[in-house]
Structure formats: structure tokens, C-alpha cells
Amino acid sequence: MSVTACQGLGFVVSLIGFAGIIAATCMDQWSTQDLYNNPVTAVFNYQGLWRSCVRESSGFTECRGYFTLLGLPAMLQAVRALMIVGIVLGVIGILVSIFALKCIRIGSMDDSAKAKMTLTSGILFIISGISAIIGVSVFANMLVTNFWMSTANMYSGMGGMGGMVQTVQTRYTFGAALFVGWVAGGLTLIGGVMMCIACRGLTPDDSNFKAVSYHASGQNVAYRPGGFKASTGFGSNTRNKKIYDGGARTEDDEQSHPTKYDYV
């Protein structure tokens, strides 16, 4: 895969992932009422990071925001923070990567500057994706813990006034936002890795520059017309491109593993 293609694909994948992270953060269905093995109620509860909602069988849906900061569980605050960090880093990553794209010419920006920016954006996307994945996983862990706690309460007869009145505890299970978040985080991470791979293809080899300084005098060029080109690599773009493409391809083959994030 060419450097431009790898960089472009990395950018697009990260962009899709970033959009998914925003969508997941805004979604109301982080946790949804568990309907399995539960008394069937005519209301359906679901909760997001910012508000909780109730949908009645009449179709009427009412959502209430969490209008408190101090009263919210620390874990929920942490998840919010992780998702926001993911979004902020994603925004910066996108802005940086736009300027870093090889297909976009901005002033007299050389390849080494673009390489640095590509690497920066790649790292930002990687951290953004990891941040989202951690955020979603923390929330999922919180749900699992609460689910089994409420299940234990449900079957140990703790609900109600001394067992006289049955109180049904609403159990919550994974909502759609968790799966969106995991996939989105994974895509952002993969896109970031692709950007980092593309950066290697954009970076001119340091040894080539050293060769230029050793053969700076004009007489060397006169005596060894092909030597200068061969040693610097400036005349051997095709060969170098092949090496970089080979590197990119090999890295891509190794990077087939991170797609496991799509299925977490």
C-alpha cells in the first residue's frame, strides 16, 4: 500500500471511529433495562452518560438530565471524562492530520514536517481510541457488577418491607452505546496505527542525508556521476518507495490483530 493510501485510509478510519466516539458519548442507551427473566413491565428504562430515559408502552418517552455533578457516582464521572478526553484528542488529531495529509499541499511544508504531523496525529488517535475503549469498558464493568448485585438481591428476598411486599428491582444490561463505543474506539486506534505506519513512509532516511554532507563538493559529482544519486537516494525514488511500501505492507499484515477490538 502506498504511503498516501495508508495515510488517507488511516485518516478515514480514524474519522469514522471519532464520529462513533461522539455518537456513543451522546447516546442515551449506555445501559438498558434487562427484559430477560424479569416481570414484564409496561415501561422501558434506559440510561446514558448525561440523562436517563423512560419509554412507556404508550410511546411517550421522558428523559431527565443528571443536573448534579456532586451526586453522581465517581465511576460515571470517570467514564464521562475518558470519553471527553477521547473526543478532544480526536478533534486535535483530525486537525493535525488534515495538515499532514500528503495529498494536501500547504505552503512549503516538506515531507519531514508532514511525517512529524502524521506521527503526532496517529499517536493522538491511538490515545483517543484507547481512552474511549477504557471508558466504555469501565462502564460495562460497572454494569456487570450492579447486575449481579441486583440479581442476588432479587433472589434473596431482600426487596420490600420484610418480604411482605414484593419490590421489583430494575436490572440494567449493556446498551447499544457500549458496542458503538467499543467499535468506534477500535477503529480510531486502528486508524491511528495506520497513520503511524504512514509516518515511516514519509520520513526520509537519516543516513541518506549524512551521505549528502560527505559528497557535497562538485568534483565528486563530476568524477562519479551515478554515485551521488545512488548514495543519497535522491535519484532512486522508485527503489526507496518499494522499500517503504514493503514496510507498510508488512506492518499492515501485523496490524490485522487490532481488528479484534471490533468484537470486544
Partner: antibody
Framework: EVRLQQSGPELVKPGASVKMSCKAS????????MHWVKQSHGKSPEWVGY????????GYNQKFKGKATLTVNKSSSTANMELRSLTSEDSAVYYC???????????WGQGTLVTVSA | DVVMTQSPSSLTVTAGEKVTMSCKSS????????????LTWYQQKPGQPPKLLIY???TRESGVPDRFTGSGSGTDFTLTISSVQAEDLAVYFC?????????FGSGTKLEIK
Amino acid sequence: EVRLQQSGPELVKPGASVKMSCKASGYSFTDYNMHWVKQSHGKSPEWVGYINPNKGGTGYNQKFKGKATLTVNKSSSTANMELRSLTSEDSAVYYCARIWYGNSFAYWGQGTLVTVSA
Amino acid sequence: DVVMTQSPSSLTVTAGEKVTMSCKSSQSLLNSGNQKNYLTWYQQKPGQPPKLLIYWASTRESGVPDRFTGSGSGTDFTLTISSVQAEDLAVYFCQNDYFYPFTFGSGTKLEIK
């Protein structure tokens, strides 16, 4: 104005079946579930079940499973309930009712009186 | 199924009097998601379908006189008529709107002296 117009009274023999209708007007028929309620003379109402006019999905009170079948005709904005294998226990007024906030029944049909008699 | 128990079964009052009737459910009708109680009160006059008075245990349906007030939470609910009028002669039913199957109470018959 929301209106639920039910079909007229029915006198049927034991073991027979009866099908009653409920024509809705004044609102978008497919937007709200239609519920059916049975009320025997001098007794409290009993919820029979509901039908989602949009998807056709139904939910029944276990007591009426196999007894009642709910259907809809979207084109005529009509909900139907068929009762089969009728006995004297099935003699009652049957109401269709449209759900509202709090899952309450704000709109009711005038009722269909079903009398099962030999 | 959720059992709804209403008391008293009948009440005889004079016009202008304050009336309270009770409804108890075998399971809590409080939804934790919105802190609302899914209990409805209906008024049924002879030969008519029930008429919605109160939903969410305390929210008065539009057009219902403000002398009708619903209160309570969880399993214990009350319908209060602050000043009974002659036209309030009817049977009052409470209904569980939270669990399927929806269930009604046996009713409280209000009679005027």
C-alpha cells in the same frame, strides 16, 4: 377529537365464535397501541390484551390466551377482537381503549355487549 | 399477577363532604427510572365506559375537576374527593399500569345520601 366506535351487541350460542370491531378516528391509528378490556356485569374490568397497529405485535393476559385473537386493519383504522369457544363466562361488555400517558386508558369505545346463551 | 385491593367497597356520603378511598398493590408500582408511580384512577358511571381521572398516581387528566386528588407511592395509594357533588355518584377503580397484565381493583362504590 379522538373517537373509538365499536360494533353492535352480539347474541351467540355456546361454543361459537364472535368477532367485534373498533373503528378509530381523530388520531393517527398506527401511533398508539389498542387495548381491549372485558367487564362482566357488576364486576371490575379485566385487561384482555393489546395490539400494536403499526407492527401487528400483540400482548395477551395469560387468562385470555387461546380465547381472544387481536387483529388490525390499517387501511380502515379498525382493531378487531375475535373470541372463540364461547361459554356463559364470556358474557360481558368488551371495550377497546387507547393508551395514554402513564399507560392509562384515556379513550374508550362505548363497548360491545356479548351475550352467550343457548 | 399484581393484586389490587380497594377499600372500602362502598361509601355513602352527603354532598359537600370529603371522601378518601384506598388502593393497595401487591407489588410496588414505582418506576425507579423516572420516580413515577404507574397507578391510574377511573370513574365509572352506570352504562358508561370508565373515565380516566388520575394517572401517574397524582396527575389529574385534563378536564377533571380539581376536587379529585390522587396521592401515594409504591404500594399504597389514595383518591380524595375534597367536596363530593351529586354527579360524583359512581364506582371508582384503581389500575396497575406498570406490570403486565394490567390489573384493576375491585372498585369503591360511592353513593350520595
